[in-house]
Interface confidence: low
């Protein structure tokens, strides 16, 4: 029995619902009474949801899963996962048994956009050209880990004196803090870009130092 799932991972935003697609080809005369369907976590074999003896056996996964009962007879064994969490990320296997048996695994990639970075400057007053300043770029509650890049006002990458830390909160979302130490020129703009590698989504922050006062666009 051929069971089909998408090759590419299913990307789902934290808090949204995701559909893990799975389909099979029912033979003529197929009845749901013949169908045994099991969704489980690929790695741990934990049961997620099942259908057997013509009945939806329900969710075994925090009551956040559902099948599409009206579509099962057409060979649609997809699983709806509600209110996606970081911890849901991974591989799910769809097992279908009628007379023959088939299975396939689909990957769920969880993502969350990063907030617009906030920029802080230390010291933040009485600055002169030649002073060393520390610029901190902070962005919150994204997933997965961010790519953090710095550049100057001309678009030149600044990679020399950068320290980036990423801490996961209790939901598994990351807060990122990137620190750039730089010697001030006469004036200048310093930009931080926080990139979500899955969503290919950027969040920008910048600070412009023009003697006094500083501006934080």
């Amino acid at each position: 029995l051929e069971v089909q799932v998408p090759e590419d991972p299913v990307v789902a935003l934290v808090g949204t619902d995701a559909t893990l697609c799975c389909s099979f080809s029912p033979e003529p005369g197929f009845s749901l009474a013949q169908l045994n369907l099991i969704w489980q976590l690929t790695d741990t074999k934990q049961l997620v949801h099942s259908f057997a003896e013509g009945q939806d056996q329900g969710s075994a996964y925090a009551n956040r899963t559902a099948l599409f009962p009206d579509l099962l007879a057409q060979g649609n064994a997809s699983l709806r996962l509600q209110r996606v969490r970081v911890a849901d990320e991974g591989s799910f296997t769809c097992f279908v048994s009628i007379r023959d048996f088939g299975s396939a695994a689909v990957s769920l990639q969880v993502a969350a956009p990063y907030s617009k970075p906030s920029m802080t400057l230390e010291p933040n007053k009485d600055l002169r050209p030649g002073d060393t300043v520390t610029i901190t770029c902070s962005s919150y509650r994204g997933y997965p880990e961010a790519e953090v890049f710095w550049q100057d006002g001309q678009g030149v990458p600044l990679t020399g004196n950068v320290t980036t830390s990423q801490m996961a909160n209790e939901q598994g979302l990351f807060d990122v803090h990137s620190v750039l130490r730089v010697v001030l020129g006469a004036n200048g703009t310093y930009s931080c870009l926080v990139r979500n590698p899955v969503l290919q989504q950027d969040a920008h922050g910048s600070v412009t130092i023009t003697g006094q006062p500083m501006t934080f666009p």
């Epitope: 790519e147 953090v148 890049f149 710095w150 950068v162 990137s178 870009l193």
Partner: antibody
Framework: QVQLVESGPGLVKPSQTLSLTCTVS??????????WSWIRQHPGKGLEWIGY???????YYSPSLKSRVTISVDTSKNQFSLKLTSVTAADTAVYYC????????????WGQGILVTVSS | EIVLTQSPLSLPVTPGEPASISCRSS???????????LDWYLQKPGQSPQFLIY???NRASGVPDRFSGSGSGTDFTLKISRVEAEDVGVYYC?????????FGQGTKLEIK
Amino acid sequence: QVQLVESGPGLVKPSQTLSLTCTVSDGSISSGGYYWSWIRQHPGKGLEWIGYIYYSGGTYYSPSLKSRVTISVDTSKNQFSLKLTSVTAADTAVYYCARRAGYSSSFDSWGQGILVTVSS
Amino acid sequence: EIVLTQSPLSLPVTPGEPASISCRSSQSLLYSNGYTYLDWYLQKPGQSPQFLIYLGFNRASGVPDRFSGSGSGTDFTLKISRVEAEDVGVYYCMQGLQTPYTFGQGTKLEIK
């Protein structure tokens, strides 16, 4: 300029695991903004990206190799490593470690490469 | 994945003459931040690749100004204004817009 040097066995038997290490000098893996990568080149062929790791442990792998590849980092030794399981002759290649610079997504520094032959 | 197609695959050039290599992408490499994520690398015989051009047209540190990158969207060109003997090797374009990062198949530049 940062230096990268690959090390590991040049010969691996089919079905076994290929293990390589890249040692970074004149620069710290722990500095942000860089992604420590593996790229390979089959004999007489082009370049294939395998994956990368960020110093904090975040990884990203090529989908075609994802099921067989693991990249890890040891910041205390300033090293990162590649493991490729269940190798076949098709995995015979020169393996390069490289540093990907953040803003440009470019591989700005490369190791000299190490030829790994898969053969019994 | 994004496919990069280079042409020509072989390029014989007389020293002092210009050379041009084309790289075509299966989708636009211009990202919403305004950057074009295309690089050029040179792999000299028996060596690892070296970084030439990043973000479409920016020369890497130490790269002679006879090398220039141009193009936008899906069509890109690497130009060498006056080829020198030390420029021989295989030139690769690479997209850094999205994973998996992919390379063109390479253009072998040789001296006539």
